[in-house]
Interface confidence: low
C-alpha cells in the first residue's frame, strides 16, 4: 500500500511568497512622482515578481514630534487622497496583491512612537487600526517598536483588533534589535505575530555563522512562522557586499518562513553608489534616467529595465526564486533541517511528505571550496541521494538541469546552489 | 533640544584651509534622516548654502564651492565639520552650521550661532 | 546654482500688509513645494518663520504667511510691528538635491 499522504497545514497568504516593502513612495518611483496614483501603475512589475504583498508607507499625516498634527486617519495630501489609495487596493486585489499599511505614528521625527505620549498614542493606533480594516488593507506594520514602552501588551492589542476582524490579516511588528532574547519576549506574547528585526544582520561573515543564528532562531521560536530579512526597513545592500547579493536571495527565499525584501533588493539598488541619496531610501533604479544627478553613475545594469533584459541577472535570479518558493510545497511548508557539510558552508534540506525535496548549499566564502555533506547529520525522513539536479545557481555558468554527484560537489566563492531530488520511499 | 555649536578659528591665512566643526547636543547625529549642513554669510551680503553631509555620510556641495569643500562627520563625537581650501579674502564670512530634515522636511530648523572666519594675512 | 531674487528692501508703517517676493527658476521654486523663509536680526542666527511654502513651526505668529504661484514665492507678514524689522531670506531645496537661498530683503518698519 502507498504511505499515507501527510496533512497539509492551514496556510495563510504571507506563508506563500515573499514581501516587497515601499516605505517611500517618492524614492520608489523616482523625480517628479511618488504617489498612490504612480504606485498603481507600478503593480504589474511587483507581479512580475510573484510577490504576496506590498509592505506600504506610511503615508498618513504627520507633522514631526507633533502628536497633534499626526492623524493615522488621513493619507498626507504629498501621496494622494483616499480615492487613490482605495483604487490601488482595488487593482492590487485583482492581481493578487495584498497590502499592508504601515501606521509607525512619528515617521518624520526623532522618536517613532512620541516617547512621552504613549498612551495618547497607542489610542491613535487602535482607531486607525479598526479605520483601516474597514478600509480594506491585508494588514499593519509598525517599526521601531523598542521605541514603545510596554510593547509586548499594546502588540497583543492590536493583534487581538487586527485577527477579531479577520484572521486573514496581519500584523507585522519591526525592531532594530538583533537580541534574540529581546525577540522572543516580544514574540512570546504575541501568537502569530509576523515580527521583523535586525538578527541575520551581521550573519554576512561565515556559513558557519549564519547556520548558528539561522538554526538558534528556528529552535527558540519552535513551531510558530518566521519572518526573514536583515532589518526591518534598510536594502540588502546596507549591510552586504554585492557578491554576497545572490547568497542571500536564496537562502532567504529557501529558509522556513516569509522572506521580506525591501524595494530595490531584487536589483541590489545600493545607495552607496549613488551620491547624495539617503542610505535608507535612494531612488529606485528603472532605467539609466532615474538617478539624473550624476551623468554616466549608472549603468544598465544597475536598473530594472537593463536587469529584465539579463537572464543572468540579480532580477532574473530573484523573479525565479520567488516563482519556486510560491509554487513548490516543500519550500512553502516544508521541514527543514540543516547538515554540516564543511567549513565556510552553510547547507540545509526542504522537504515535505512524497513532494519533490530540495537541498540549499551556500558558500559564505571567499574560496571555492569542496562541500563534504554529513548525512549523517539528518532524520531518516530526509535522507540524502547520491546525486541532485541542479535547479540553479547563484552563479553563471554551471548547465542547470544536470545532475550533481553530492559526494563530489565543489562550490565557487560566494556561490549558492539549489538542488532538487524525488522523494524516495 | 538640538543644539549646533561651531568651533575653529577665526583668522585663517591667505591659501591655506579653512577648517570647521559644528558640535551637535541634544540628539544623535546618526540617528535620523537629516541633513548635517553648512552655510556662510559674507559681512552684510546675504546668505549662501556650501553644502550638507546625509547622517549616512553621503554628501552635496554648492557648485560653485564644490571644488574645495570637504564635509565630514564623527558620529562618535557627535560633530561634522567643514574644511575650504585655498581661501581667499573673498571667503571672510560668519559660517553657520545647521539641520535640515529628516527626509522631506526640507527646511533648516535647527541653526548655531554663527563663528565668524577671517581670510587675512 | 543662482540665488533666488528678492527685492533689495521694502517698508511698511506699523498696522500695515507688506509682501517679499521670491523669484526662482523651474530647478527650484517652481520644482518643489520646498521653500522655506528665515528673519534674520542683525548679529543672530536665522530664524525659520515659513516652511513647505505655506506652513508655520509652533510659536511663529499668524501674521506671517506664505504662498507661492509658479516660480515666485512670496511672505505677507500682515499687521506689521516694530519687532519685525530685520532681513527676511527665502530658500528653497533643488532638483539637484542642494538648497538655494534668495539675496535677503531688509525690512523697515517706519
Known amino acids: 500500500r502507498a504511505p499515507r499522504c501527510r496533512e497539509l497545514p492551514a496556510q495563510k497568504w504571507w506563508h506563500t511568497g515573499a514581501l516587497y516593502r515601499i516605505g517611500d513612495l517618492q524614492a520608489f518611483q523616482g523625480h517628479g512622482a511618488g504617489n498612490l496614483a504612480g504606485l498603481k501603475g507600478r503593480l504589474d512589475y511587483l507581479s512580475s515578481l510573484k510577490v504576496k504583498g506590498l509592505v506600504l508607507g506610511p503615508i498618513h499625516k504627520n507633522q514631526k514630534d507633533d502628536v497633534a498634527q499626526t492623524d493615522l486617519l488621513q493619507i498626507d495630501p504629498n501621496f494622494g487622497s483616499k480615492e487613490d489609495f482605495d483604487s490601488l487596493l482595488q487593482s492590487a486585489k485583482k492581481k493578487s496583491i495584498r497590502v499592508i499599511l504601515d501606521l509607525t505614528p512619528n515617521y518624520r521625527g526623532e522618536n517613532s512612537w512620541f516617547s512621552t505620549q504613549v498612551d495618547t498614542v497607542a489610542t491613535k493606533v487602535k482607531d486607525a487600526l479598526e479605520f483601516w480594516l474597514q478600509a480594506g488593507v491585508d494588514g499593519f506594520q509598525v517599526r521601531d517598536i523598542e521605541n514603545l514602552k510596554d510593547a509586548s501588551s499594546f502588540l497583543a492589542e492590536w493583534q487581538n483588533i487586527t485577527k477579531g476582524f479577520s484572521e486573514d490579516r496581519l500584523l507585522i511588528a519591526g525592531t532594530n534589535s538583533s537580541d534574540l532574547q529581546q525577540i522572543l519576549s516580544l514574540l512570546e506574547s504575541n501568537k502569530d505575530l509576523l515580527l521583523t528585526s535586525s538578527y541575520l544582520s551581521d550573519s554576512g561573515s561565515t556559513g558557519e555563522h549564519t547556520k548558528s543564528l539561522v538554526t538558534q532562531y528556528l529552535n527558540a521560536t519552535g513551531n510558530r512562522w518566521c519572518s526573514w530579512s536583515l532589518s526591518q526597513a534598510r536594502l540588502l545592500t546596507s549591510f552586504l557586499p554585492a557578491q554576497l547579493l545572490r547568497l542571500y536571495q536564496l537562502m532567504l527565499f529557501t529558509l522556513p518562513g516569509t522572506p521580506v525584501f525591501s524595494y530595490g533588493d531584487e536589483i541590489g539598488l545600493d545607495a552607496a553608489a549613488l551620491p547624495g541619496q539617503p542610505m535608507e531610501a535612494p531612488v529606485m533604479l528603472w532605467d539609466e534616467s532615474s538617478f539624473p544627478d550624476i551623468p554616466g553613475a549608472v549603468s544598465a545594469n544597475m536598473t530594472v529595465k537593463g536587469q529584465s533584459e539579463d537572464p543572468g541577472s540579480l532580477l532574473s535570479l530573484f523573479r525565479r526564486l520567488s516563482d519556486q518558493r510560491s509554487k513548490e510545497r516543500s519550500l512553502l511548508h516544508g521541514d527543514f533541517h540543516a547538515f554540516s557539510a564543511g567549513p565556510g558552508l552553510f547547507s540545509y534540506i526542504r522537504h515535505w511528505d512524497q513532494n519533490e525535496r530540495f537541498l540549499v548549499v551556500l558558500n559564505f566564502g571567499d574560496v571555492g571550496l569542496s562541500a563534504g555533506l554529513q548525512a549523517s547529520d539528518l532524520p531518516a525522513s530526509a535522507s540524502l541521494p547520491a546525486k541532485a539536479d541542479l535547479l540553479l545557481s547563484t552563479q553563471p555558468g554551471r548547465e542547470e538541469g544536470s545532475p550533481l554527484e553530492l559526494e563530489r560537489l565543489k562550490l565557487e566563492p560566494h556561490e549558492g546552489l539549489l538542488l532538487r531530488f524525488p522523494y524516495a520511499a | 533640544q538640538v543644539q549646533l555649536q561651531e568651533s575653529g578659528p577665526g583668522l585663517v591665512k591667505p591659501s591655506q584651509t579653512l577648517s570647521l566643526t559644528c558640535t551637535v547636543s541634544?540628539?544623535?547625529?546618526?540617528?535620523?534622516?537629516?541633513?548635517w549642513s553648512w552655510i556662510r554669510q559674507h559681512p552684510g551680503k546675504g546668505l549662501e548654502w556650501i553644502g550638507y553631509?546625509?547622517?549616512?555620510?553621503?554628501?552635496y556641495y554648492n557648485p560653485s564651492l564644490k571644488s574645495r569643500v570637504t564635509i565630514s562627520l564623527d558620529t562618535s563625537k557627535n560633530q561634522f565639520s567643514l574644511k575650504l581650501s585655498s581661501v581667499t579674502a573673498a571667503d571672510t564670512a560668519v559660517y553657520y552650521c545647521?539641520?535640515?530634515?529628516?527626509?522631506?522636511?526640507?527646511?533648516?530648523?535647527?541653526w548655531g550661532q554663527g563663528t565668524l572666519v577671517t581670510v587675512s594675512s | 546654482q543662482s540665488a533666488l531674487t528678492q527685492p533689495a528692501s521694502v517698508s511698511g508703517s506699523p498696522g500695515q500688509s507688506i509682501t517679499i517676493s521670491c523669484t526662482g527658476t523651474s530647478s527650484d521654486v517652481d520644482n518643489y513645494n520646498y521653500v522655506s523663509w528665515y528673519l534674520q536680526h542683525p548679529g543672530k542666527a536665522p530664524k525659520l518663520m515659513i516652511y513647505?511654502?505655506?506652513n508655520r513651526p509652533s510659536g511663529i505668529s499668524t501674521r506671517f504667511s506664505g504662498s507661492k504661484s509658479g516660480n515666485t514665492a512670496s511672505l505677507t507678514i500682515s499687521g506689521l510691528q516694530a519687532e519685525d524689522e530685520a532681513d527676511y531670506y527665502c530658500?528653497?531645496?533643488?532638483?539637484?538635491?542642494?538648497?538655494?537661498f534668495g539675496g535677503g530683503t531688509k525690512l523697515t518698519v517706519l
Open positions: 545647521a539641520r535640515a530634515g529628516p527626509k522631506w522636511e526640507l527646511w533648516f530648523d535647527y
Open positions: 513647505d511654502v505655506s
Open positions: 553631509i546625509y547622517y549616512s555620510g553621503s554628501t
Open positions: 541634544g540628539g544623535s547625529i546618526s540617528s535620523g534622516a537629516y541633513y
Open positions: 530658500s528653497s531645496f533643488t532638483s539637484s538635491s542642494t538648497w538655494v
